[in-house]
C-alpha cells in the first residue's frame, strides 16, 4: 500500500525531518507549513491547527519561506546620490546603487552603506585606474610628452602632438602649440596615431569601468566631499 | 502625471449615507495603498483608513471600523469610502490620499478632497 | 494608539526668523516612518518631509527636519511668505496612523 500523504501538522516519524517548506515547531513537536514569500506567520501551528501565514505589512518584506513573526523591514529609501535598482516589495528588499560617478565606499553584507564621488584628477593628472562600483579613481601624473587639461574622472593622460614648428611646447597640463603647418601626433606605446590636420583633434576613447560583482548598495550615509588626493580634486 | 481625482460636494440628512470616489491615474494601481483622511471645519487631519487596491485588504482606526467601508473597483482605478449613519459630526472635508509600498507610508499624492455636509 | 503631540500649535513669525516645530510622540516610532505634511487653507495637504529628514523634489531646501525615537523637529532655517501654513507630522509605525493636532504658522 503507498505511503499517506501526511497534512500538516502531523508528528514526524522518529529520526525523520519535515519535508520541503515545513518546520519543525519545537512547542507544537509537529511538522507544520512555512509561510511563502511576502508572507509572515500571524499565528504559528499547534498539535492540531496549521500555521497561519498573512502578507508583510508596509515597506516590509520577506525573501524566503519562513515561519518568522514579522517581516523584515525594507532599507531606507533612497538618497539623492543613488538609483534605486530593486524596488521595496513584499518579496524583495530595496536596492540602491551608487548613481553614476560615485561608487561603493563602504560596503555591506548586502548592498553599500557609503557612496562617494568619484575623485576628479585635475589637469597634469590622468587616470590611471578607472572608477569601478567599489573603487575609486586613481589618478598618475602625465609623464613627459603626454598631457591632460581638464579635471575630470575619465580622461586619460594624451600624446602631444608633434609640430613641424613649435610655438609653445607642451607641457603636463597643456598640448603642444604648433605654428600653422600642419604637426603629426608623437605615437603612443601599444598604439598607432596617424598623422592628423591642424584643425581637427585626435579622438580619445574614455575607459570603461571595469566589470564588478560588488554586492549592489542599499544605503548611503551623510558624507562630505573627500579630501582630494595628490593629482585629484573635488567637486 | 499622478492624479487623484475625487467626487463632488454631498450635502447629506443625518442618518443617512454617502460613497465618495477617488479616480486615479498617471500610475499602477498595483503598488500602492489608498488612504482616506478625513478634516472638520477648523480642525486637524485624521487617518480613517486604507485599502490595498490590488487585494482589497483594508485597515481602519477602529474609531471608523463600523462607520467606514472602503473598497476599490481597479478596472476603472478608483477607490471608494461609504460613510453609514451620518451625524452632524461627520461634517468634514474627506480626502483620498496614496502611498507607494516601501516609502514607509509617506502619502505623496492627495486628492482634492470632497466636502460632505451632514445637516437637517 | 500613538498620540502625536505637536507644540507650539501656533506660531506668529516675521520673514527671515528661523522656526522650529517639534512632534512628540507618545511611544518610539523608527525614524522611516514619520512624515511631515503642509497645508495651506483651502488646499490639499502636501508631503514636505518624508522619513524624518528626507525633502521631496520641490520642497525648498531651507526645510529640515531631525529626530528620533519620540522626538522630532520640522525647521525652517530663513522664513518666506509662501512658508506660512500649518504643518502636521504623521506617523506609520504602528497602526492606527496618526497625525500631529497641527502647528499653524502665521505672520507676525
Known amino acids: 500500500l503507498p505511503a499517506q500523504v501526511a497534512f500538516t501538522p502531523y508528528a514526524p516519524e522518529p529520526g525523520s525531518t519535515c519535508r520541503l517548506r515545513e518546520y519543525y515547531d519545537q512547542t507544537a513537536q509537529m511538522c507544520c507549513s512555512k509561510c511563502s514569500p511576502g508572507q509572515h506567520a500571524k499565528v504559528f501551528c499547534t498539535k492540531t491547527s496549521d500555521t497561519v501565514c498573512d502578507s508583510c505589512e508596509d515597506s516590509t518584506y520577506t525573501q524566503l519561506w519562513n515561519w518568522v513573526p514579522e517581516c523584515l523591514s525594507c532599507g531606507s529609501r533612497c538618497s539623492s546620490d543613488q538609483v534605486e535598482t530593486q524596488a521595496c516589495t513584499r518579496e524583495q528588499n530595496r536596492i540602491c546603487t551608487c548613481r553614476p560617478g560615485w561608487y561603493c565606499a563602504l560596503s555591506k553584507q548586502e548592498g553599500c552603506r557609503l557612496c562617494a564621488p568619484l575623485r576628479k584628477c585635475r589637469p597634469g593628472f590622468g587616470v590611471a585606474r578607472p572608477g569601478t562600483e567599489t573603487s575609486d579613481v586613481v589618478c598618475k601624473p602625465c609623464a613627459p610628452g603626454t598631457f591632460s587639461n581638464t579635471t575630470s574622472s575619465t580622461d586619460i593622460c594624451r600624446p602631444h602632438q608633434i609640430c613641424n614648428v613649435v610655438a609653445i611646447p607642451g607641457n603636463a597640463s597643456m598640448d603642444a602649440v604648433c605654428t600653422s603647418t600642419s604637426p603629426t601626433r608623437s605615437m603612443a606605446p601599444g598604439a598607432v596615431h596617424l598623422p592628423q590636420p591642424v584643425s581637427t583633434r585626435s579622438q580619445h576613447t574614455q575607459p570603461t569601468p571595469e566589470p564588478s560583482t560588488a554586492p549592489s548598495t542599499s544605503f548611503l550615509l551623510p558624507m562630505g566631499p573627500s579630501p582630494p588626493a595628490e593629482g585629484s580634486t573635488g567637486d | 502625471q499622478v492624479q487623484l481625482v475625487q467626487s463632488g460636494s454631498e450635502l447629506k440628512k443625518p442618518g443617512a449615507s454617502v460613497k465618495v470616489s477617488c479616480k486615479a491615474s498617471g500610475f499602477n494601481n498595483k503598488d500602492i495603498y489608498m488612504h482616506w483622511v478625513r478634516q472638520a471645519p477648523g480642525q486637524g487631519l485624521e487617518w480613517m483608513g486604507r485599502i490595498d487596491p490590488a487585494t482589497g485588504n483594508t485597515k481602519h482606526d477602529p474609531k471608523f471600523q463600523d462607520k467606514a467601508v472602503l473598497s476599490s473597483d481597479t478596472s476603472v482605478s478608483t477607490a471608494y469610502l461609504q460613510i453609514s449613519s451620518l451625524k452632524a459630526e461627520d461634517t468634514a472635508v474627506y480626502y483620498c490620499a496614496r502611498s507607494p509600498y516601501g516609502d514607509f507610508g509617506a502619502m505623496d499624492y492627495w486628492g482634492q478632497g470632497t466636502l460632505v455636509t451632514v445637516s437637517s | 494608539d500613538i498620540q502625536m503631540t505637536q507644540s507650539p500649535s501656533s506660531l506668529s513669525a516675521s520673514v527671515g526668523d528661523r522656526v522650529t516645530i517639534t512632534c512628540t510622540a507618545s511611544?518610539?516610532?523608527?525614524?522611516?516612518?514619520l512624515h511631515w505634511y503642509q497645508q495651506k487653507p483651502g488646499s490639499s495637504p502636501k508631503l514636505w518631509i518624508y522619513?524624518?529628514?528626507n525633502l521631496p523634489s520641490g520642497v525648498p531646501s531651507r526645510f529640515s527636519g531631525s529626530g528620533s525615537g519620540t522626538d522630532f523637529t520640522l525647521t525652517i532655517s530663513s522664513l518666506q511668505p509662501e512658508d506660512f501654513a500649518t504643518y502636521y507630522c504623521h506617523q506609520y509605525h504602528r497602526s492606527p496612523w496618526t497625525f500631529g493636532q497641527g502647528t499653524k504658522v502665521e505672520i507676525k
Open positions: 522619513s524624518t529628514s
Open positions: 511611544s518610539s516610532v523608527s525614524s522611516n516612518y
